[in-house]
Interface confidence: medium
Amino acid sequence: LVPHLGDREKRDSVCPQGKYIHPQNNSICCTKCHKGTYLYNDCPGPGQDTDCRECESGSFTASENHLRHCLSCSKCRKEMGQVEISSCTVDRDTVCGCRKNQYRHYWSENLFQCFNCSLCLNGTVHLSCQEKQNTVCTCHAGFFLRENECVSCSNCKKSLECTKLCLPQIENVKGTEDSGTT
């Protein structure tokens, strides 16, 4: 199967690596701009230089390109608890992350929020907290895991998944049936 190529990829594939087809003259291959720069003017002819200009403050290009504009630098989302790991430069976007003892929870592919790593109170650390994953806890006897916290079996109602873990205690628990809600 031949992969589907967009118009720009088709045009680029005719030229050797590091060059692109002049948009007005498909017999000319112009040299792409280095990262940190953008295309100001196409090369006037074969073997002549492409006019590339450095990205302005607040913008970047991270790879060789023939973009007419640099990309805007990302801003770390303070309301998501994000902190700036490294500032934006002309050739690299801002890098955002979380503070120490926090992990990234990705709500969607490009959106993450920082949460505190679980401390596994009333349990032990099974897997340590990682950059993109909370601590995995194992609970002590008399406790069950709910939303990665060790909760006393006295909070276990008969219809919940905790019943197996809290089997010896469950008979003493008073509470109404609770169809899967927690």
Partner: nanobody, 123 residues
Framework: EVQLLESGGGLVQPGGSLRLSCAAS????????MTWVRQAPGKGLEWVSW????????YYADSVKGRFTISRDNSKNTLYLQMNSLRAEDTAVYYC????????????????WGQGTLVTVSS
Amino acid sequence: EVQLLESGGGLVQPGGSLRLSCAASGFTFADYNMTWVRQAPGKGLEWVSWIDQEGVFTYYADSVKGRFTISRDNSKNTLYLQMNSLRAEDTAVYYCAKDFSAAVMLRTSFDYWGQGTLVTVSS
């Protein structure tokens, strides 16, 4: 094209009620778990409630437990959030979201979101 369209938000007094709806299209609604998430002004996202494909299992954040009820009508491709005993701290933009998978996961990841509906609780 997947679309999620929330409605039902508005201004309500403390102690009042609202029912949010989320009309889904562009995917087989009955095949996916759904979630309500909210974002208070200037704050991060907060997971509110989750419901499985068939509407049998539901989960709630502690902050809304006993006051909010999530439900779905697969014949109408619609997700609901009944909000009672509303408090000032419930003021937020409420989003419905489609889960990536059918796995039971709290704080899961979403591949599609609605545009949100604003709920303001104020006297």
